[in-house]
């Protein structure tokens, strides 16, 4: 059952697991819910009748009824994690906690105009996980402005003190805000030499990684495959660090993979949800329960019902016996990781999908699409929509892509002469548009947010926000597609598509079938060279053959210029302008994307 | 089912104002863009503005814009348009059409206004 | 704005008849064109909408097509209670406009 409220003057006896400090019960509840165990905590907050060195506590606890006793106590504070709820979770905690000093390492200090100069420096330093920020007004002088950048083993505070005129907070980096580069590759047969800070076990390097990127003081890591000579070492995950933050040196050895954290890319990558199943490999750990399943993925469904399963096996049944139904073991262990991985011994198993929610639903896989042809198929692009105006008559007027369960993103020109947001409708989950009939469901706007610097297509800031009235309930026909990390600038894209019900040739009309074009990317040297009346800016993408044939056209304006990179599809443009449609060495121009996550961030996630 | 019911004939003098009314029932009345038409004795349709009631956002054929009024009260579900400085080319029979989903489905019965000294 | 030129203005035709009724759009319009009945005394009543989607109730003899510039109104077998003005009307673009009508009698 899913409990979000806070019980105050309230603590939860026994059951304790383990105590961290954190600033607000607010932050309690997304630690316990981020630990693999916690199903509870009690927090103190500060109060006279409180001893100061409990203030601030939070005491993670599980109990195997999922309940524990309530005892009242003044100034405590208890809960539920958000394990037991279905909804979206996020560790992303943008708080500024006044006059609270929250004790860490202090491995860096200079100075900074503002705590949130502060809290941008802390976002974009990997080792940081905190910050505390001595203000223009605090008593020491030389302390003044003065920014601290800490780090803890376990990225919570080792302490939290009252302190006047500081300010404390958090690394966005779980926002999505960090501009540390995303480095996805994994290096076949490379040791990473540097120190261990943890080790667990894992079924593949992938889930290693996984484990990596959601452990707090890993930075990279190397996994040691089945077939890895030392047996004792099979299947080891080796969590690691450094001061500079990279591997100070990489070993040749067969068998074993490295590879580095994803935690500037995690919002666009899953990172909790280890999907796979894992046949003829037995996960051992402490049996929570046994019970009859049809098959590996019901034991799977079985276990993320279970809130406090993390692991299972399956052992298949043997010829006719217990009507076909199998045995699924139910697991969990101290870190939620196998205690140790078999093979050969005929099991199937895997994880929980229940810590799938804690990763951005656009990294869910959607089907496999249909190679070639210019039609779509149902739920190949589940994050495109059709956005329609009802003036003069209703009909499409651009593209979008959903980006959040509120949020489309779309081309600023697409709303020249739309006096209101209340005229237009989105409809999503849409192939064909004779599907919109007069009783087809929609999502009413409720805002248009333009970029305030955005004056016309082609001299860029060509992007736009629409805030829908109602949210949108994710399916396979409707979800959202992953904005680009701010990592990945970098990244070559080599898979992109361009789609939309727009024009196939200049003088046409809107097509009734969504279309789709596979168009390569143009460096904006290129680009720039086609169009030399035109500033082609760092803020726009260009994409074209130079030959022509493939582009976007009229009323494909807004749509996503979609790229698949590491199985995951990021919003890398959106239709903006181009001389005519199609024509050769005349480009499509696009707003470019990862230029505009933080615009993007900023307002989708105001208060 | 979808009814728009006018306001019944004027007569009016020339210089004079008229507001005309038009209640909707049966549909969600916010939901839908409301037109008006002209349509002179003998003549055919003359498209004069059309609102948004929802929004209050209004469209005016250039030739209305300074006289023609639109308002919508979304309380009563009811659309007005008044007419002022009124001469006697503005004779006609006035309607209120719904735009549905692709074109104007219902219709008002239509008022008569008749402008003489 | 764009100009709706209907033709003919009039015309007389026998019950059973094909009656064909055309509308030139000065400028293209797509498919965004209605056609609409009007009988004396009576408001006009919406017999096609996107050129060529027959409205709810309206008699299947009633049909119509074109795009961009050029529309036509057919009536495959003309009937009595046929007779009416009729006029198409763009939904295009502000200003919206209609034809100057083709009132239809019968012979």
């Known amino acids: 059952e899913c409990v979000t409220q806070l019980l105050k003057d309230t603590c939860f006896e026994g059951g304790d697991i383990t105590t961290v400090f954190t600033p607000s019960a607010k932050y309690c509840q997304v630690v316990c819910t981020y630990h693999p165990r916690c199903l509870l905590f009690t927090f103190t907050a500060e109060s006279p009748s409180e001893d100061p060195t409990r203030w601030f506590t939070c005491v993670l606890k599980d109990s195997v009824t999922e309940t524990l006793p309530r005892v009242n106590r003044t100034a405590a504070i208890s809960g539920y994690s958000f394990k037991q709820c279905s909804h979206q979770i996020s560790a992303c905690n943008k708080d500024i906690y006044v006059d609270l000093d929250m004790k860490g390492i202090n491995y860096n200090s200079s100075v900074a105009k503002s705590a949130q100069e502060c809290q941008e420096r802390c976002t974009d330093d990997v080792h940081c996980h905190f910050f505390t920020y001595a203000t223009r007004q605090f008593p020491s002088l030389e302390h003044r402005n003065i920014c601290l950048l800490k780090h803890t083993q376990t990225g919570t505070p080792t302490r939290i003190t009252k302190l006047d005129k500081v300010v404390s907070g958090f690394s966005l980096k779980s926002c999505a805000l960090s501009n540390l580069a995303c480095i996805r590759d994994i290096f076949p047969n490379t040791v990473f030499a540097d120190s261990n800070i943890d080790s667990v076990m894992a079924p593949d390097a992938f889930v290693c990684g996984r484990i990596c990127t959601h452990h707090p003081g890993c930075l990279f890591f190397t996994f040691f495959s089945q077939e890895w000579p030392k047996e004792s070492q099979r299947n080891l995950c080796l969590l690691k660090t450094s001061e500079s933050g990279l591997p100070s040196t990489r070993i040749k050895k067969s068998k074993a993979l490295s590879g580095f954290s994803l935690q500037s890319c995690r919002h666009s990558i899953p990172v909790f949800c280890h999907s796979s199943f894992y046949h003829d490999t037995d996960f051992l750990g402490e049996e929570l329960d046994i019970v009859a399943a049809k098959s590996h993925e019901a034991c799977q469904k079985l276990c993320t019902n279970a809130v406090r399963c993390q692991f299972f096996t399956y052992t298949p049944a043997q010829a006719s016996c217990n009507e076909g139904k199998g045995k699924c073991y139910l697991k969990l262990s101290s870190n939620g990781s196998p205690t140790k991985i078999l093979h050969g011994r005929g099991g199937i198993s895997g994880y929980t999908l229940r810590l799938c929610k804690m990763d951005n639903e656009c990294t869910t896989k959607i089907k496999p699409r249909i190679v070639g042809g210019t039609a779509s198929v149902r739920g190949e692009w589940p994050w495109q929509v059709t956005l329609h105006t009802t003036s003069p008559t209703q009909r499409h007027l651009c593209g979008g892509s959903i980006i959040g369960n509120q949020w489309i993103l779309t081309a600023a020109h697409c709303f020249y002469g739309v006096e209101s947001p209340k005229i237009l409708r989105v409809y999503s989950g849409i192939l064909n548009q004779s599907e919109i009939k007069e009783d087809t469901s929609f999502f009413g706007v409720q805002e248009i947010i333009i970029h305030d610097q955005y004056k016309m297509a082609e001299s860029g800031y060509d992007i736009a926000l629409l805030k829908l009235e109602t949210t949108v309930n994710y399916t396979d026909s409707q979800r959202p597609i992953c904005l680009p990390s701010k990592g990945d600038r970098n990244v070559i894209y080599t898979d992109c598509w361009v789609t939309g019900w727009g024009y196939r040739k200049l003088r046409d009309k809107i097509q009734n079938t969504l279309q789709k074009a596979k168009i390569p990317l143009v460096t904006n040297e290129e680009c720039q060279k086609r169009y030399r009346g035109h500033k082609i800016t760092h803020k726009m993408i260009c994409a074209g053959y130079r030959e022509g044939g493939k582009d976007a056209c009229k009323g494909d304006s807004g749509g996503p210029l979609s790229c698949k990179h590491n199985e995951v599809w990021h919003l890398v443009g959106i239709t903006s302008w181009g001389e005519g449609c199609a024509q050769r060495e005349r480009p499509g121009v696009y707003t470019n994307v990862v230029e505009y996550v933080d615009w993007i961030l900023e307002k989708t996630q105001a208060v | 089912q979808v009814q728009l019911v006018q306001s019944g004939s004027e007569l009016k003098k020339p210089g004079a104002s008229v507001k005309l009314s038009c209640k909707a029932s049966?549909?969600?009345?916010?939901?839908?863009?409301m037109h008006w038409v002209k349509q002179a004795p003998g003549q055919g349709l003359e498209w004069i503005g059309n609102?948004?009631?929802?929004?209050?956002?209004?469209n005016y054929d250039e030739k209305f814009r300074t006289r023609a009024t639109l308002t919508a009260d979304t309380s009563t579900s009811t659309a007005y348009m008044e007419l002022s400085s009124l001469r006697s080319e503005d004779t006609a029979v006035y309607y209120c059409?719904?735009?549905?989903?692709?074109?104007?489905?219902?219709w008002g019965q239509g008022t008569t206004v008749t402008v003489s000294s | 704005d764009i100009v709706m030129t209907q033709s003919p203005s009039s015309l007389s035709a026998s019950v059973g008849d094909r009656v064909t009724i055309t509308c030139k759009a000065s400028e293209n319009v797509v498919t965004y064109v209605s056609w609409f009945q009007q009988k004396p005394g009576q408001a006009p009543k919406l017999l096609i909408y996107?050129?060529?989607n027959r409205y709810t109730g309206v008699p299947d003899r009633f049909s119509g097509s074109g795009s961009g510039t050029d529309f036509t109104l057919t009536i495959s077998s003309l009937q009595a209670e046929d007779v009416a003005t009729y006029h198409c009307?763009?939904?295009?673009?502000?200003?919206?406009?209609f034809g100057q009508g083709t009132k239809l009698e019968i012979k």
């Open positions: 996107g050129a060529s």
């Open positions: 059409t719904r735009m549905g989903f692709y074109a104007m489905d219902y």
């Open positions: 609102i948004y009631p929802d929004s209050d956002s209004t």
């Open positions: 009307g763009q939904s295009y673009s502000y200003p919206l406009t």
């Open positions: 049966g549909y969600t009345f916010t939901r839908y863009w």
